[in-house]
Amino acid sequence: EDELQVIQPEKSVSVAAGESATLRCAMTSLIPVGPIMWFRGAGAGRELIYNQKEGHFPRVTTVSELTKRNNLDFSISISNITPADAGTYYCVKFRKGSPDDVEFKSGAGTELSVRAKPS
């Protein structure tokens, strides 16, 4: 029970085009030290959606204040959803390394499906 777990409680989220999608993720521990990243898809071809450490992600906002001490909630909200955003999103914990951080543990994934905008 003590080892870090990555919790993605929703297995599937359905959002209408144009709306925002909230993808929930939390860690059960602050250890090991290292950033969280969100990806769409798995494997070598996965797409980086958000990097806690660096980068500019204009459509992504964090649900809670990530700089807050002892924060364990790494949920994100993606604005203005389009059908192209459909896919499975993974919240991934990295362990701080040198020179590169190392992937430590991934959440089970949340499948985002996009409904047509209500007329």
Partner: antibody, heavy 121, light 112 residues
Framework: QVQLVQSGAEVKKPGSSVKVSCKAS????????ISWVRQAPGQGLEWMGG????????NYAQKFQGRVTITADESTSTAYMELSSLRSEDTAVYYC??????????????WGQGTLVTVSS | DIVMTQSPLSLPVTPGEPASISCRSS???????????LDWYLQKPGQSPQLLIY???NRASGVPDRFSGSGSGTDFTLKISRVEAEDVGVYYC?????????FGGGTKVEIK
């Protein structure tokens, strides 16, 4: 051994509110989902909403949105369900149930004993 | 919301005989990770519900092996290979793929 112990039966007047508690022992409270499920007399099971304390915020079924508030106090490992604007149709047994974390996070593997709420004038 | 439909509503059974309950969902419960997010519960008379089967086909701890779950996507089945007197009660399927979680209407199993 995980146990969920709920508060006792309540009799309430229409229009009032009720707050039911569910104290958990065993396991790590913060990373488990606590759901609230109700059962009207002779009827089936109905999921009202749930909370994973580590996230702080709850999810609610549309039917109860605006009338139910689910909270969790990590310091006492207790979850609460408050239902307002009570009407006679809210007479039911209210259960709390705990789910596992990770890939089965909303699985209801442990249940409280149930709390009977009777709404009557 | 995902709608869960169970059949039959009532199932009279003879001890020692098999029994089968069907559950259908209004949309697929098969996730890209290969799991079906469908659970089965039994509520014995006067008791809280108890978990029988999770993720479509996995028996919960302490559940006798006469209970089995099968199916994928939108069609699921709970089978009891040989019904015992203690198996009477109401059986519910429930989907946990999407919030809100939704239950089937229940199937009442009673001894003939």
């Amino acid at each position: 051994q995980v146990q969920l112990v709920q508060s006792g039966a309540e009799v309430k007047k229409p229009g009032s509110s009720v707050k039911v508690s569910c104290k958990a022992s065993g396991g790590t409270f913060s990373s488990y989902a606590i759901s609230w499920v109700r059962q009207a007399p002779g009827q089936g099971l109905e999921w009202m909403g749930g909370i994973i304390p580590i996230f702080g915020t709850a999810n609610y079924a549309q039917k109860f949105q605006g009338r139910v508030t689910i909270t969790a106090d990590e310091s006492t490992s207790t979850a609460y369900m408050e239902l307002s604007s009570l009407r006679s149709e809210d007479t039911a047994v209210y259960y709390c149930a705990r789910g596992r974390p990770q890939s089965e996070s909303y699985l209801l593997d442990y249940w409280g004993q149930g709390t009977l709420v009777t709404v009557s004038s | 919301d995902i709608v869960m439909t169970q059949s039959p509503l009532s199932l009279p059974v003879t001890p020692g005989e098999p029994a089968s309950i069907s559950c259908r969902s209004s949309q697929s419960l098969l996730h890209s990770n290969g799991y079906n997010y469908l659970d089965w519960y039994l509520q014995k008379p006067g008791q809280s519900p108890q978990l029988l089967i999770y993720l479509g086909s996995n028996r919960a701890s302490g559940v006798p092996d006469r209970f089995s779950g099968s199916g994928s996507g939108t069609d699921f089945t709970l089978k009891i290979s040989r019904v015992e007197a203690e198996d009477v009660g109401v059986y519910y399927c429930m989907q946990t793929l999407q919030v809100p979680l939704t239950f089937g209407g229940g199937t009442k199993v009673e001894i003939k």
